[in-house]
């Protein structure tokens, strides 16, 4: 519960925070758990404790292990654990999963990528940023304070972003790199006045008496998740449920999201055992959302059965 995972690369600076919090005046003692050996506070040591922080300047693979911090408060001691792993530098460009910080998402309107853990270090701007190991260049990329801003984000901007900065401790400089994935969310959805794709306005649908018939009402309402959108059928201006004809039922079709991102709905009207009187009814396909209502009317006409006799 009171443990936190930290990782870094050999020959880089790594600063780790004690998972237990307290007041600035509380004493914090650090120990290497495996040996129970106290971590020195003198800054001349490569690994030293500085209050809530444990500093590896620079880190070595052999530093890996569990470190115990004890925050000494007036009434009780709060113990926390920092699980530290130092990895060898990869010769290739690929950043393994175990070196990745949490993934962040961006969209056209918000494309900030924060440099992970940077608040622990004494650094000065500017940050250097890399995507898939390539230095980022061009006016679309702006390093601002501790984050990267990407203008006009596109899906191709998804990938692994590495920030690189210099930590300064008593005049000595140490390099730090941190990598996280960036994913691009679809742009914010929008809502339009309903557009009915089928049936066409005043369409005549041919049906065979005695057979079953299906009519599909299909409409699109905009892009992305829609707050309120519905498609339905009416018979002579009356809801299907109120019309009282058990042979005629409506059934929700597939919610569709086309490749162009449009959010569309289908409603299928099923007429069992078509009768003559069904030809006299007016069938209305209704599509409605917050913008309003659109109606397309269909009528049925008799289709003569194909004569198979010679």
């Amino acid at each position: 519960k009171f443990s936190k995972q930290s990782w870094g690369l050999e020959n880089e600076a790594l600063i780790v925070r004690c998972p237990r919090q307290g007041k600035p005046s509380y004493t914090v003692d650090w120990y290497y758990s495996q040996t129970n050996k106290s971590i020195p506070t003198q800054e001349r040591n490569r690994v030293f404790a500085s209050g809530q922080l444990l500093k590896f300047l620079p880190a070595a693979v052999a530093d890996s292990g569990i470190y115990t911090c004890i925050v000494r408060s007036p009434t009780f001691n709060r113990t926390g654990y920092a699980n530290v792993t130092i990895y060898k530098k990869q010769s290739d460009c690929n950043v393994p999963d175990y070196l990745m910080y949490s993934t962040v998402s961006g969209s056209e309107k918000n494309s900030k990528i924060y440099c992970p853990t940077i608040d622990l270090y004494n650094w000065t701007a500017p940050l250097e940023w890399f995507k898939n190991c390539q230095a980022l260049q061009g006016s679309r990329y702006r390093a601002h304070k501790s984050f990267l801003v990407i203008d006009n984000v596109m899906t191709e901007d998804a990938g692994d972003y590495t920030c690189k900065f210099i930590h300064n401790e008593n005049g000595a400089n140490y390099s730090v790199t941190a990598t996280r994935s960036f994913t691009v969310k679809d742009e914010q959805g929008f809502s339009l006045f309903p557009v009915i794709g089928a049936p066409a306005q005043n369409e005549i649908k041919e049906v065979e008496i005695g057979k079953n018939a299906n009519l599909t009402c299909s409409a699109c309402f905009g892009k992305g998740t829609q707050f309120l959108a519905a498609v339905l059928w009416q018979l002579n201006g009356t809801k299907i449920t109120d019309f009282g004809e058990p042979r005629i039922q409506q059934e929700e079709g597939q919610n569709q999201s086309f490749s162009n991102g449009l959010a569309c709905l289908d409603m299928v009207l099923r007429i069992a055992d078509v009768k003559e009187e069904d030809l006299l009814l007016q069938y209305d396909c209704l599509a409605l959302n917050l913008h309003g209502l659109r109606r397309h009317t269909v009528r049925l006409s008799r289709k003569n059965p194909i004569d198979h006799h010679s």
Epitope: P19, Q21, Y26, S73, P74, T75
Partner: antibody, heavy 116, light 113 residues
């Protein structure tokens, strides 16, 4: 500069729950714990609990145990206090206050009124 | 729980007066580990948010006028306003900043004569 901005006033019925948010800015959120303090009209300040914002571990005052839940969202630099089974005596101004030597930084307060 | 008892509960004084508010805790607020007294003083003006004046029993928060001072150790503490000003009209609270649950005194309401 350090700022703590709380959510707006709430009116609740007895038995309901209320959730108050506290958005921090101007400092690194996970470096400091966050306390919640309330003040009923004309009464003294009353500490409700605090949360370790780094690991999400809350500590509650005995008077509120079982009714209060303090959480945080580090990505939004926001702490939350939820109080359930509200009664009329929970009518108060609720404050978030950053941990430190004393509470140097406070939210503006959120008035919660419990009335049938 | 540590009980915090403030006195007086209210007082009225003239501009320029020296004002003293006392606070007693039911247990010592001195931490032997660093010799700090974990006691804080706050000022709360009507309808406003509490403002930290003093922490560690005697350390003035930055920006707080020098007329405010804190003293005491263990269980007995004092807040002194050396020369009362009209803007000091407020309720003053002491707080146990030593152990959970953090507790506050009942407050001292300071009025200007």
């Amino acid at each position: 500069q350090v700022q703590l901005v709380q959510s707006g006033a709430e009116v609740k019925k007895p038995g309901a729950s209320v959730k108050v948010s506290c958005k921090a800015s101007g400092y690194t959120f996970i470096n400091y714990g966050m306390n919640w303090v309330r003040q009923a009209p004309g009464q003294r300040l009353e500490w409700m609990g605090w949360i370790n914002t780094y690991i999400g571990e809350p500590t509650y005052g005995d008077n509120f145990k079982g009714r209060v839940t303090i959480t945080r969202d580090t990505s939004a630099s926001t702490a939350y206090m939820e109080l359930s089974s509200l009664r009329s005596e929970d009518t108060a101004v609720y404050y978030c206050a950053r941990e430190g030597e004393g509470f140097a930084y406070w939210g503006q307060g959120t008035l919660v009124t419990v009335s049938s | 729980d540590i009980q915090m008892t403030q006195s007086p509960s209210s007082l009225s004084a003239s501009v320029g007066d020296r004002v003293t508010i006392t606070c007693k805790s039911s247990q010592s607020l001195l931490y032997s580990g660093n010799q700090n007294n974990y006691l804080a003083w706050y000022q709360q003006k009507p309808g406003k948010v509490p403002k930290l004046l003093i922490y560690g029993a005697s350390t003035r928060e930055s920006g707080v006028p020098s007329r405010f001072s804190g003293s005491g150790s263990g269980t007995d503490f004092t807040l002194t306003i050396s020369s009362l000003q009209p803007e000091d009209l407020a309720t003053y609270y002491c707080q146990n900043d030593h152990s959970y649950p953090y507790t506050f005194g009942g407050g001292t309401k300071v009025e200007i004569k």
